[in-house]
């Protein structure tokens, strides 16, 4: 599976579209996860609505939003207020029971505004790889200052 490389500017939004065979993936929820290592776990960031017929509704976790057009066969993920810490290798997944089929691998590269040296704060990655949803995310306004926020849901 080829990796798509996408670039985004820090502070702006980045939209990712993953296309799939609408018939083959009929009735399946979609998910967006971050790969923690080359052969390591892919931590769930966000997944589409639990009721498949409502998959078109936007579902949010922190600054990441997912919505699925099940007729067109396109799942759209939006990374809002992109930060340097959002850079990484991600997967669009189609969920079938406990199994996840990779639809697309996406490498997100975050380009800094040379006049604005900002970065994300520490990200809490759950030790278990089953779910990333509800993870604690801390943001900061500069590389050397860290501010904690309560967990997102």
């Amino acid at each position: 599976l080829n990796t798509t490389v996408l670039q985004g500017m820090a502070g702006q939004s980045l939209r990712v579209s993953c296309t799939y065979d609408a018939l083959k993936h009929w009735g399946r929820r979609k998910a967006w996860c971050r790969q923690l290592g080359e052969e390591g776990p892919c931590q769930r960031v966000v997944s589409t609505h639990g009721v498949w017929l409502l998959a078109f509704l936007k579902k949010r976790n922190g600054s990441t939003v997912i919505a699925d057009d099940t007729l067109a066969g396109t799942v759209t993920i939006t990374l809002k207020n992109l930060q340097a810490g959002d850079a990484g290798l991600y997967q669009c997944q189609s969920l079938r029971g406990r199994e996840a089929e990779v639809l697309q691998k996406v490498l997100v590269e975050v380009l800094e505004d040379p006049l604005d040296d900002q970065d994300a704060g520490d990200l809490w990655v759950p030790e278990e790889s089953s779910s990333f949803e509800g993870a604690q995310v801390e943001h900061s306004t500069s590389r050397n200052q860290e501010t904690s926020f309560p967990p997102t849901s």
Partner: antibody, heavy 119, light 107 residues
């Protein structure tokens, strides 16, 4: 097999310049962030600089900011570190490393090249 | 910047021993921590990332735990090839700072 091979180290006088190179093979170079980490003789590890897979953004430790420049040539699978205004405290083994997808940990390292700054 | 402090600075063990070394961050870093092993004259090697994930080829006797500010690297049964210096590193958010290292020596 991932391989990183540094070159360009040597003896240089304080205030001088040196350019380190790192030839990468065994992986899709343009898909990875890269970094330099150094280790002074008998001391611990210190992150020096990183850059994104396209080279569009660069990051530096405060100790080298304004003096060192990291860059890459994806067509040649090569990473560079231009070091100017060198000081005695820059004496170290410099390691070329592959940084996992912007996560700040280094999954593969070169064998290192020694830079000695002395008069 | 967040400081990483390792303890002890050195420890002695025999083959087969269970050893534990710690890494303390000056601020909460979630579980954004990596561990490396370095032998004299060699480049460091990645052992664990995000606190507890073993890198490719790393034996199961190496394990990591902790979160927030306190982290532990455990070698369940030390082997001859494990005598080396171990470094922790705060990851995910720059600057990526390392601890000063813990040297594991043969008793």
């Amino acid at each position: 097999e991932v391989q990183l091979l540094e070159s360009g180290g040597g003896l240089v006088q304080p205030g001088g310049s040196l350019r380190l190179s790192c030839a990468a093979s065994g992986f899709t170079f343009s898909n990875y962030y890269m970094a330099w980490v150094r280790q002074a003789p008998g001391k611990g590890l210190e992150w020096v600089s990183s850059l994104t897979n396209s080279g569009g953004s660069t990051y530096y430790a405060d100790s080298v900011k304004g003096r060192f420049t990291i860059s890459r040539d994806n067509s040649k699978n090569t990473l560079y570190l231009q070091m100017n205004s060198l000081r005695a405290e820059d004496t170290a083994v410099y390691y070329c490393t592959r940084e996992w997808a912007g996560s700040g940990y280094f999954d593969y390292w070169g064998q290192g090249t020694l830079v000695t700054v002395s008069s | 910047d967040i400081q990483m402090t390792q303890s002890p600075s050195s420890l002695s063990a025999s083959v087969g021993d269970r050893v534990t070394m710690t890494c303390k961050a000056s601020q909460n870093v979630g579980n954004n921590l990596a561990w490396y092993q370095q032998k004299p004259g060699k480049a460091p090697k990645l052992l664990l990332y995000y606190t507890s994930n073993r890198f490719t080829g790393v034996p199961s006797r190496f394990s990591g735990s902790g979160s927030g500010t306190d982290f532990t690297l455990t070698i369940s049964s030390v082997q001859p090839e494990d005598f080396a210096t171990y470094y922790c590193q705060r990851i995910y958010n720059s600057p990526w700072t390392f601890g000063q290292g813990t040297k594991l020596e043969l008793k």
